[in-house]
């Protein structure tokens, strides 16, 4: 393990608050939670809750912890090594191509298709024809039967930020 | 002593390029973080970029993001600022500095940059 | 980002007499990143205070920073001719890194 430097091995002008964890950079990098001094001499812990860095790493600035928006709910928080990690509330999904908002599920498929995949925080319903069995492209149809469906079980985070 | 002298200065066109560099000397370059800070005639101070030692780590001001790029050569102690698409707003000194975030403590002379047709 | 704000935009003061500027954050400052700079016309800046507090190398101890927050201030306990000139707070808590837009002290 690194050793703690300590304030008086430090240049003059690049000491930092007492208040933070310092330990040795290998090899010009440093560890998971951390991010590099500016005189490169030493790593400084990242501050909970607040900022995060998952790699080894010479960053100047930990990384901003996301904060998750409303429509969304907050599956695990950010540690040090690890940013939040946020998913759209039942009933509504994040998709690849617009990740900045939670959109709503269908609550069914337009006419001649049948449901085969639920809606989950990561994707919506799916639908397919009922004859050949091909992927409705899934735009919002203009007429919906009257088949609903339930929210699927989160299985995963959809959007795992960092 | 801890020197560092920019070069690359000069009048270029609304949409064209330049390319400042940094020599310091006086310090062991690879393991600092450098920056660039520049001043518009008349005007304050202005971050324009900063880099990690081993020049792994970069940032930007939002202002000259997609168009600067800083980078660093470690066995000449050389820092970089490619600059393209220059604007008008661009036009200034730019001055190099070691440090980046505690403070900058050490600045260069700086190079002007003239940015006009 | 991090906006600083710093007042007054000029002080007229005599040799002698005490000088207080204020550097105030948007968002909260940690103090290991708050650094005061002095610029005099055509030169470059000179680093006065890093830590918001720390003395740089060779500054003269009529110089002196404190503050925590959002609230900062450089003092300079009497001005000497050579101390009136532009002056610059400057943070680094948290990208982009920023200046303040200046405190001129000026001769009265």
């Known amino acids: 393990e690194s050793a703690l430097i300590t304030q008086q091995d430090l240049a003059p002008q690049q000491r930092a608050a007492p208040q933070q964890k310092r330990s040795s950079p290998s090899e010009g990098l440093c560890p998971p939670g951390h991010h590099i001094s500016e005189d490169g001499r030493d790593c400084i812990s990242c501050k909970y809750g607040q900022d995060y860095s998952t790699h080894w790493n010479d960053l100047l600035f930990c990384l901003r912890c996301t904060r998750c928006d409303s429509g969304e709910v907050e599956l695990s928080p950010c540690t040090t090594t690890r940013n939040t990690v946020c998913q759209c509330e039942e009933g509504t999904f994040r998709e690849e191509d617009s990740p900045e908002m939670c959109r709503k599920c269908r609550t069914g498929c337009p006419r001649g298709m049948v449901k085969v995949g639920d809606c989950t925080p990561w994707s919506d319903i799916e639908c397919v024809h009922k004859e050949s069995g091909t992927k409705h492209s899934g735009e919002v149809p203009a007429v919906e039967e009257t088949v609903t469906s339930s929210p699927g079980t989160p299985a995963s985070p959809c959007s795992l930020s960092g | 002593e801890v020197q560092l002298l920019e070069s690359g200065g000069g009048l270029v066109q609304p949409g064209g390029s330049l390319r400042l560099s940094c020599a310091a000397s006086?310090?062991?370059?690879?393991?600092?973080?450098m920056s660039w800070v520049r001043q518009a005639p008349g005007k304050g101070l202005e971050w324009v970029s900063a880099?990690?030692?081993?020049?792994?780590?970069?940032y930007y001001a939002d202002s000259v993001k997609g168009r600067f790029t800083i980078s660093r050569d470690n066995s000449k102690n050389t820092l970089y600022l490619q600059m393209n698409s220059l604007r008008a707003e661009d036009m200034a000194v730019y001055y190099c500095?070691?440090?980046?975030?505690?403070?900058?403590?050490?600045w260069g002379q700086g190079t002007l940059v003239t940015v006009s047709s | 980002e991090i906006v600083l704000t710093q007042s007054p935009g000029t002080l007229s003061l005599s040799p002698g007499e005490r000088a207080t500027l204020s550097c105030r954050a948007s968002?909260?400052?940690?103090?290991?990143?708050l650094a005061w700079y002095q610029q005099k016309p055509g030169q470059a800046p000179r680093l006065l205070i890093y830590?918001?507090?720390s003395r740089a190398t060779g500054i003269p101890d009529r110089f002196s920073g404190s503050g925590s927050g959002t609230d900062f201030t450089l003092t300079i306990s009497r001005l000497e001719p050579e101390d009136f000139a532009v002056y610059y707070c400057?943070?680094?808590?948290?990208?982009?890194?920023?200046f303040g837009q200046g405190t001129k002290v000026e001769i009265k």
């Open positions: 500095a070691k440090g980046a975030r505690v403070s900058f403590d050490y």
């Open positions: 830590g918001a507090s």
């Open positions: 400057q943070q680094g808590s948290q990208p982009p890194i920023t």
């Open positions: 006086g310090f062991t370059f690879s393991s600092y973080a």
């Open positions: 968002q909260s400052v940690s103090s290991s990143y």
């Open positions: 880099i990690s030692g081993s020049g792994g780590s970069t």
